[in-house]
Amino acid sequence: CDLPQTHSLGNRRALILLAQMGRISHFSCLKDRYDFGFPQEVFDGNQFQKAQAISAFHEMIQQTFNLFSTKDSSAAWDETLLDKFYIELFQQLNDLEACVTQEVGVEEIALMNEDSILAVRKYFQRITLYLMGKKYSPCAWEVVRAEIMRSFSFSTNLQKGLRRKD
């Protein structure tokens, strides 16, 4: 499956929206920084099959959608930017779903790529636990926003690599 150019653009637009969503200086939240253990190895195109990488992207976008569609998130961010962000994520989910089913088929993908999917879930579980522990403070959300931007940037670079391999 050739990930469409629109998917890469959508990812870039999502990153721009995440950047615009920042409300406070990242520097004022340095004391709240945290290592969430981003599962970089799951997105390593050299080690993993393309289908696995696509599954991991899909799970990452789904979990990002879940994270930013909570009521705690709605209170933290600008509603207009958040709505635009949802639309980008939703579009990306659609692109990836089409890709996933084209590659192998839904059932087989779920079984084949469970390890990479679970790695992404554990990562997002840590993010959720961190937010809960920090009582969803503005700085905690800022740290999470920056973290999601970092993980999106990483996956965008890998997607470029995947397209080149095709």
């Epitope: 253990g37 599962p39 799970e59 789904q62 979990q63 879940n66 469970e114 390890d115 679970l118 790695a119 879930r121 554990k122 997002f124 579980q125 840590r126 959720t128």
Partner: antibody
Framework: EVQLVQAGAEVKAPGESLRISCKVS????????ISWVRQIPGKGLEWMVK????????IYNPSFQGHVSISVDKSITTVYLQWSSLQASDTAIYYC???????????????WGQGTLVAVSS | DIQMTQSPSSLSASVGDSVTITCRAS??????FHWYRQKPGKAPELLIY???NLQTGVPSRFTGSGSGTECTLTITSLQPDDFATYYC?????????FGQGTKLDVR
């Protein structure tokens, strides 16, 4: 086949140290959380601690924090529970369990070891 | 900590009967309710996860329902294997907690 195989029973005196093990096989070790659960004979179940074998990130039940420690050895896909100084009240069966994590990030315990009986008596 | 209270604590029934066990949480745990069965001298085994989902390999005579602060486990057409102790669990908040157990024995 997913398996969590625990070490045999241990009889110890108060004040002694102990490490019990749980050897896992049949799946990718680093993909799932592992927890320890205590069951005092004839009583209910108590969750103690969980660990992510990928990088040893841990979450403790405050009731057990400071009294036990959890660790992993990735090279032999084994999880450990350790005491530096046992008490009579540590007498119990200890189960290691694997967590499954759903898309909505709900943990549940889908596979259990057979249990290790630890008896602490003078 | 979130307290989990099971009722009844013990229950007598016969093969072929239907029974219901209830679990109440001291605060809402959404659908983060799970049910386990423990046979004498054995490790617990998962029956139902996320309040109502049947674990693979578990017979369909086991059903779970509920969310929020209350959930139930219903066993229809009891089999000899089902006489055991049943535990509910919540994994919504740390520390994870279990109910005190419901012992199901033969009438």
């Amino acid at each position: 086949e997913v398996q969590l195989v625990q070490a045999g029973a241990e009889v110890k005196a108060p004040g002694e140290s102990l490490r019990i093990s749980c050897k896992v096989s049949g799946y990718t070790f680093t993909s799932y959380w592992i927890s320890w659960v205590r069951q005092i004979p004839g009583k209910g179940l108590e969750w103690m601690v969980k660990i992510d074998p990928r990088d040893s990130y841990t979450i403790y039940n405050p009731s057990f924090q400071g009294h036990v420690s959890i660790s992993v050895d990735k090279s032999i896909t084994t999880v450990y529970l350790q005491w530096s100084s046992l008490q009579a009240s540590d007498t119990a069966i200890y189960y290691c369990v694997r967590h499954y994590l759903t898309q909505s990030l709900v943990d549940y315990f889908d596979h259990w070891g057979q249990g290790t009986l630890v008896a602490v008596s003078s | 900590d979130i307290q989990m209270t099971q009722s009844p604590s013990s229950l007598s029934a016969s093969v072929g009967d239907s029974v219901t066990i209830t679990c109440r949480a001291s605060q809402s745990v959404s659908n983060y309710f799970h049910w386990y069965r423990q046979k004498p001298g054995k490790a617990p085994e998962l029956l139902i996860y996320s309040a109502s989902n049947l674990q693979t390999g578990v017979p369909s005579r086991f059903t779970g329902s509920g969310s929020g602060t209350e959930c139930t486990l219903t066993i229809t057409s009891l089999q000899p294997d089902d006489f055991a102790t049943y535990y509910c669990q919540q994994t919504h908040g740390y520390p994870f907690t279990f109910g005190q157990g419901t012992k199901l024995d033969v009438r």
